[in-house]
Structure formats: C-alpha cells, structure tokens
C-alpha cells in the first residue's frame, strides 16, 4: 500500500480467483484512543472498533472511503483505491490501446517544434468518475523538470457502437535546449483513477522523434505565361522553430486529380516554391518535414488548381 | 578545406556532405515500425557516445560567437562514429548486405571529419569504448542503436553547417 495523495491510498492487488488478497491496517488520525468505530462509504454498518482497523482487500467491494468516528463525530478518512495485477500484468482498462505506432500505445505525444513544448493525448470510453494527473521529466535517474498543465477533455467521437473521449495535456520542458542533441528521453507518467480503480501509464520519447510540423502556410499559385505550369509557393508555418536557416524543413508537393485513382505527381524540394503542371479539377498540396531528421510529415496544406 | 584553430570551415562543402550523411544514416536504418531500442537497456552503449550538448556552442548564437567549440565537438563525434562503423560491430557477423549504405556512411563520416581537420592538425578525440558483443543478435541490436544515435548526431551537425553556410560564409 502506498499514499497517492493526502488520505488517498493505493492497494496493489495481485488478483486471481480465490486469491487471499492484501491485508491492510488502517489507523485513525486522532489522539483519541477509546470509543472509535469504523464504517465504509455511506453505510452505517460498523466494521470494527479501536484506533486501528485490519481489513483483507480481495476485490473492489473492499475498496472505498473508510471513516473512523467517535460519538457521531468524524475523526478521519482513508480512501482506498485498487491497482490490480492479473497474470503478472497491471491492468490497463481505463485507457484504450491506440495501436499506433505499435500495440500497447496508450499515450501519444507530438511536438510542433524543438522548443520543448509537447502535447500528449489518450482515449477512453469512460465518461464519468474519471480523473487524470500528469507528471513529466527529462530522464529518470536524475530528472530535469518538465511542467505539465491539467489534462482536459479535448474531443468526443462516436464510431458505430463506440463513444470515445479524448483527453490531452500540454507540457513544457523547463530548461529546453532546442539546438542540442537529446541524450536523455522525456518521461511522461499519467495516473488515471476511475471510481476506485487506479492505473498508471507511461511513455518515453525524444522530442526529435515526436516532431510533427504544422502544415506550410500561405500556399499560393502563380500561373506561368503561355504554359500549363504554375509556380506554387508557400511559407514555413509560424509554429516552426527559428531561425529557419538552422531549423530547416523539406517539402513534398503533390498534384492530385479529383479521383483518388488518378496518378499522383510528387515533387520533393528544400525550397519554398516549385513549378508543377496543374491539371483541370486537380488540387495542389504541400506538406513539411524536418530536413535532417525523419520524424512525421505535417498534414497537407491544399489549394485547388482552378 | 576547413582549417581548425581560428579560421572558418568550408561551410558549403560541409553542409552538402552533412546533408548526405543524414540521408545515408536514414537509409542505413529506416524507421523500422518505430522500433523502440531504448527499451533494450542501452546504458553500456549509447551513454558513451559523444552528444552535442547545450553548452557546446552549436546553437545559432554560439556559432556566431565562436564556432570552434561546436566544430571541435562535431569532429570528435564524427571520428567516434567513424571508428564504430569500422569496428567488428559492423564488420562481423551477420554480414552487411553488399549494397548496404553503411560503407558509404563510413566513408562520408571520414570525409567530413577530414574537411573539418586536415592532416597535421589535431583536436582531442574521444576514446572509443571497447564493445565486442559475442552474439550476432547482440551485434545486430548494437548496430541499430548506433545508427539511431548517429541519425540524431548528424541531424544537429547538418543544422550547424546549413546555418553556417547561410550566415557565416565569407
């Protein structure tokens, strides 16, 4: 058993059918010695008397808020949560496995640049009685500070018989060094509590591996005289790291016909313009990627050929 | 050619070669399904690798003030990786495929390090750790880790030379 926060305790339960459970001793936080009784949650049933109460925690029915009283007055509370292990594996029932980029991916994180700011998000199908707490650091043995805000509900999606809730959090490394080569990964730890169930989730990454630039901005077409060719131009997104001579992007320009089956023409360039042939009813799209490190491409920025 | 000490390197040549290094490093080890090699306990390998750190002067301001600190650090790393790629980690079993980019990568690391430091001039180089994994699978894992680490190193080096070519060239 360990303390999650004041008066809230997590009991680690290795569960299997007929498991003996965990013996837990609760102590009433009071100088009083006599006449103390114990109850669980809203029930008035007396579970025991005395300054300490020994319970056997076998299942969620044994968790909850234990209260000690004396003569009708509440002396102290202890909220017991369960962290369940089955077949040697801690439960991961609260969050959905996003399966991208690999199985058992519960937390996904992205950064728009090298400033040390990043966003993580996760999915759940639970709509109520749910709290999250996020901590982060750079490295684990001698951790350097990363400050995370509060996790907030950022989206709700209905997919057939499933309703999903997306939560996200923004974090900022306290002393970020955008130009340095990271040697210690960022660690993100999420505590999730649903009713009386405690679970924790972790992710470890380098900022360079979660970079996804915003799409290029100000995408424009300039027709070339007496030609089907157009000059496409664009700019670096505002959110990208500066100076651009140092933090450079590379771009992919795509000409796509109305039909998905039509052949796509693609051009790769380090410049912020390109000359392409504009077909009728086609659209031109441009996306960006770090020039020197193959992290994610941005989403496409698009304009119609007409 | 670059001349260490006080004068400037051939920024444009360095830029071109470092960008080529980035391409080669990624073709030698593409993102294999986001293979997370940090889970494999890599203290003994990649902790000894020279990283370009915050105080090494490789940021735009540091390069403007005095690029020599940064160039020395990059040179140190290039020599380190050049030695690693020439060691039995890469020459031993399992053999690399004949068309593997590792050979080109090795030659380009040497080429860039020579651009930064011609014969007769010596910056201090870092001692290469003695890593001789006994099992072929260990060697394979070590190769992946070294290449992942090299990708990060050459990315920073390429940014340095691109910025130098754009802002510090005579």
């Amino acid at each position: 058993i360990w303390e999650l926060k004041k008066d809230v305790y997590v009991v680690e339960l290795d569960w299997y059918p007929d498991a003996p459970g965990e013996m837990v001793v609760l102590t009433c936080d009071t100088p009083e010695e006599d006449g103390i009784t114990w109850t669980l949650d809203q029930s008035s049933e007396v579970l025991g008397s005395g300054k300490t109460l020994t319970i056997q925690v076998k299942e969620f029915g044994d968790a909850g808020q234990y209260t000690c009283h004396k003569g009708g007055e509440v002396l102290s509370h202890s909220l017991l949560l369960l962290h369940k292990k089955e077949d040697g594996i801690w439960s991961t029932d609260i969050l959905k496995d996003q399966k991208e980029p690999k199985n058992k991916t519960f937390l996904r994180c992205e950064a728009k640049n090298y400033s040390g700011r990043f966003t993580c998000w996760w999915l759940t199908t639970i709509s109520t009685d749910l709290t999250f707490s996020v901590k982060s650091s750079r490295g684990s043995s001698d951790p350097q500070g990363v400050t995370c805000g509060a996790a907030t509900l950022s989206a709700e999606r209905v997919r057939g018989d499933n309703k999903e809730y997306e939560y996200s959090v923004e974090c900022q490394e306290d002393s970020a060094c955008p130009a340095a080569e990271e040697s210690l990964p960022i660690e993100v730890m999420v505590d999730a509590v649903h009713k009386l169930k405690y679970e924790n989730y972790t992710s470890s990454f380098f900022i360079r591996d979660i970079i996804k630039p915003d799409p290029p901005k100000n995408l424009q077409l300039k027709p070339l005289k007496n030609s089907r060719q157009v000059e496409v131009s664009w700019e670096y997104p505002d959110t990208w790291s500066t100076p651009h001579s140092y933090f450079s992007l590379t771009f992919c320009v795509q000409v796509q016909g109305k039909s998905k089956r039509e052949k796509k023409d693609r051009v790769f360039t380090d410049k912020t313009s390109a000359t392409v042939i504009c077909r009728k009813n086609a659209s031109i799209s441009v996306r960006a990627q770090d020039r020197y490190y193959s992290s994610s491409w941005s989403e496409w920025a698009s304009v119609p050929c007409s | 050619r670059a001349v260490p000490g006080g004068s400037s390197p051939a920024w444009t040549q360095c830029q071109q070669l470092s960008q080529k290094l980035c391409t080669l490093a990624w073709s030698a080890h593409p993102l294999v399904g986001h293979m997370d090699l940090r889970e494999e306990g890599d203290e003994e390998t990649t902790n000894d690798v020279p990283h370009i750190q915050c105080g090494d002067g490789c940021d735009p301001q540091g390069l403007r003030d005095n690029s020599q600190f940064c160039l020395q650090r990059i040179h140190q790393g290039l020599i380190f990786y050049e030695k690693l790629l020439g060691s039995d980690i890469f020459t031993g079993e399992p053999s690399l495929l004949p068309d593997s980019p590792v050979g080109q990568l090795h030659a380009s690391l040497l080429g860039l390090s020579q651009l930064l430091q011609p014969e007769g001039h010596h910056w201090e180089t870092q001692q290469i750790p003695s890593l001789s994994p006994s099992q072929p699978w260990q060697r394979l894992l070590l190769r992946f880790k070294i290449l992942r680490s090299l990708q990060a190193f050459v990315a920073v080096a390429a940014r340095v030379f691109a910025h130098g070519a754009a802002t510090l060239s005579p």
């Epitope: 569960w15 299942e59 029915g61 199908t125 018989d161 649903h194 009386l196 169930k197 | -």
Partner: nanobody, 123 residues
Framework: EVQLVESGGGVVQAGESLRLSCAAS????????MGWFRQAPGMEREFAAA????????YYADSVKGRFTISRDNAKNTVYLQMSSLKPEDTAVYYC????????????????WGQGTQVTVSS
C-alpha cells in the same frame, strides 16, 4: 447509456439446469465488466458471478461456485449464466448488471441493471 435485457428464467426441479441470457446494447458495451446478482423475496440483492470485459477472467460467490458458469460472447453482446445442480435456495429474481470495476461483488460498483428474470426451483 447501456440497456440490459435478461431472458431464460423459468420453473425447474431441484438438480436441473437453466441458462440465463443477458443481451446488452448501447455505447461501448464490450468495455463493461458484466455480473449476475439475485434477490430472493424479503432478502437483499446478492452477488452470484462476474466476468471481465475481455472474458478471460471470472469471479463467483462461494454459494454458486462449481455449479454456475458465467460466459460472454462479445460478438453478440450477450452474457450467459449457466446454472446446474439447482437448489430451492437458488429461487430468486436474477439481474444482469454492467460496470467497470472487476472483480466486485458489491452492487453499487455496477452502473447499469436489467429488469430481472424469475427463476423458481421447486423441490
């Protein structure tokens, strides 16, 4: 919202078997742990069995262990309670329940309940 509809109740002789079904519908039903409770006249509702949302783990009250088997078919969104060697003291209204805390034998850990199906075991 999750809707639960029980079926399969009836009158049987002691020693016989019966299979109860609980059809679940609504959002995210596959993510719920499912349980069966029962309530005899004048008694409190008591736990009988529960199954995890993956269907890989089951939990039983001592009074039914070895006689009752809980199972689920996630493709059909249905939970079953196979009852064998029935006794007169198994007579009760059987309720299907859905919740997110497994294992739990406490009724208030379950969020949704069916209307119940009557099982009568005569001697």
């Amino acid at each position: 919202e999750v809707q639960l509809v029980e079926s399969g109740g009836g009158v049987v002789q002691a020693g016989e078997s019966l299979r109860l079904s609980c059809a679940a519908s609504g959002y995210n039903v596959k993510d719920y742990e499912m349980g069966w409770f029962r309530q005899a006249p004048g008694m409190e509702r008591e736990f009988a069995a529960a199954i995890s949302w993956r269907g890989s783990s089951t939990y039983y009250a001592d009074s039914v262990k070895g006689r009752f088997t809980i199972s689920r078919d996630n493709a059909k969104n249905t939970v079953y309670l196979q009852m064998s060697s029935l006794k007169p003291e198994d007579t009760a209204v059987y309720y299907c329940a859905a919740g997110r805390l497994y294992p739990s034998s406490r009724s208030r850990d379950y969020d949704y309940w069916g209307q119940g199906t009557q099982v009568t075991v005569s001697s």
